[in-house]
């Protein structure tokens, strides 16, 4: 197949991505004597970067886009893992379109799973956004979660907290959150496994089995939450803690109620 | 570098089996590819048809999946097209490819007739 | 499923340059390969990855990608430049490659 010539060497960063069609014409316009305003690096196309887990078959290619400006013009790098990313890190290296903000991995095999991170910055900031990449077999494979979801969480007493699991599953997955319990005091039953109580399950009733709301939270609802995602191949899961706080003394009402929580527990299996 | 050839029956007749096999030399299926099939109707586009891993894994055009086999023979080096119930709308040159993101190279293409 | 959109014709004069273009939703995510097909024989890989070049093919193929559309530029052009030419992405979304639907290249004169 070609080998391109690794890495290449695109143009510089244009200020005015290519690939954003906003209008850019509310930003002032230099005049012949003036500088031009410093401006720190900012995205110019968000809404092209919320995917940030690409679970991806072996032997594909796979493009990560960071669109950006600033001025002057920014820098692009990429971080694998939080180090630096050399084209000799993998094989047949990987391609940086400066023009377009964008890196390009040809081929990828498994090796190649982790998190990318785009910085972009000029003397004014910096700012930077990761992907994850997942290289799978072709489906059906095991349930894929994105990763930092979901995430923990510290709120006040009676609000409301949302978590997150981002799921990549084929064949259909199914999707329960559980929170793990003390029965009798002890947080693990008889037979070695933590005690648990399903608070949700993709199935009916369930709108939207990826995002668990808890509303007007107790400090009884403290503690680890565990998003599990589990087909017919294999399982996934991934926890979060939610930290329930009081407010300061002279906030407090008068007397506290505390609602009646009723635990219905099985054993995690 | 690597060559690819189909070989199978140029004639297939209405509501049987359409088989082809494509045979790798100059490189091993076992490489970090997809081995592709794409057809192409007389006076008319490319179509992906589908794929396969040397581990077995495939994937298939939607409008064909229900009728669509591709297998591997590594010990052979070769993989095969089965293509179900055919019609006369079936009637095209049929190519394999390597495939990582793209096609490169392709066999040079056979014509499969249906007709009885 | 993933649309891939060209014109079905394109003519140039020899010398002139040819832009073929390739419409799909938010293509320049994706990486955008084409391919020239003469009668009578199988498709050749002339631009991949956007804008990159397989050995053999001649600098006057070149690529871009951004946006909602991909452009194959063939600069200077020959009557030997004179066939069908495709447009192809594997969509990421799906797990499915998608062809265009092929642009028909006529050298004039």
């Known amino acids: 197949r070609p080998s391109p010539t690794l890495p290449e060497q695109d143009a510089l960063p244009s200020s005015e991505d290519d690939d954003d069609d906003d209008d850019s014409s509310s930003e002032e316009k230099e005049t012949d004597n003036t500088k031009p305003n410093p401006v720190a690096p900012y995205w110019t196309s968000p809404e092209k970067m919320e995917k940030k887990l690409h679970a991806v078959p072996a032997a594909k290619t796979v493009k990560f886009k960071c669109p950006s400006s600033g001025t002057p013009n920014p820098t692009l790098r990429w971080l694998k893992n939080g180090k630096e990313f050399k084209p000799d890190h993998r094989i047949g290296g990987y391609k940086v379109r400066y023009a377009t903000w964008s890196i390009i991995m040809d081929s990828v095999v498994p090796s190649d799973k982790g998190n990318y991170t785009c910085i972009v910055e000029n003397e004014y900031g910096s700012i930077n956004h990761t992907y994850q990449l997942d290289v799978v077999e072709r489906s059906p494979h095991r349930p894929i979660l994105q990763a930092g979801l979901p995430a923990n969480k510290t709120v006040a007493l009676g609000s409301n907290v949302e978590f997150m699991c981002k799921v990549y599953s084929d064949p259909q997955p199914h999707i329960q959150w559980l929170k793990h319990i003390e029965v009798n005091g002890s947080k693990i039953g008889p037979d070695n496994l933590p005690y648990v109580q399903i608070l949700k399950h993709s199935g009916i009733n369930s709108s939207d089995a990826e995002v668990l709301t808890l509303f007007n939270v107790t400090e009884a609802q403290s503690g680890e939450y565990v998003c599990k995602v589990s087909n017919y191949i294999g399982e996934a899961n991934q926890s979060a803690w939610l930290t329930v706080t009081r407010p300061a003394l002279e906030e407090r009402p008068a007397v506290m109620t505390s609602p009646l929580y009723l635990e219905h527990h099985h054993h995690h299996h | 570098q690597v060559q690819l050839q189909e070989s199978g029956p140029g004639l297939v007749k209405p509501s049987g089996t359409l088989s082809l096999t494509c045979a790798v030399s100059g490189g091993s299926i076992s490489s970090n590819n997809w081995w592709s099939w794409v057809r192409q109707p007389p006076g008319k586009g490319l179509e992906w048809i589908g794929e396969i891993y040397h581990s077995g894994s495939t994937s298939y055009n939607p409008s064909l999946k229900s009728r669509v086999t591709i297998s591997v023979d590594k010990s052979k080096n070769q993989f095969s097209l089965k293509l179900s119930s055919v019609t006369a709308a079936d009637t095209a040159v049929y190519y394999c490819?390597?495939?990582?993101?793209?096609?490169?190279?392709w066999g040079q293409g056979t014509l499969v007739t249906v007709s009885s | 499923s993933y649309v891939l959109t060209q014109p079905p014709s394109v003519s140039v004069a020899p010398g002139q340059t040819a832009r073929i273009t390739c419409g799909g939703n938010?293509?320049?995510?994706?990486?955008v390969h084409w391919y020239q097909q003469k009668p009578g024989q199988a498709p050749v890989l002339v631009v991949y990855?956007?804008?990159d070049r397989p050995s053999g093919i001649p600098e006057r193929f070149s690529g871009s990608n951004s946006g909602n559309t991909a452009t194959l530029t063939i600069s200077r052009v020959e009557a030997g430049d004179e066939a069908d030419y495709y447009c192809?992405?594997?969509?990421?979304?799906?797990?499915?490659?998608?062809f265009g639907g092929g642009t028909k290249l006529t050298v004039l004169g």
């Open positions: 192809q992405v594997w969509d990421s979304t799906s797990d499915h490659r998608v």
């Open positions: 490819a390597r495939a990582t993101d793209w096609y490169d190279p």
């Open positions: 990855d956007d804008s």
């Open positions: 938010n293509i320049g995510s994706e990486s």
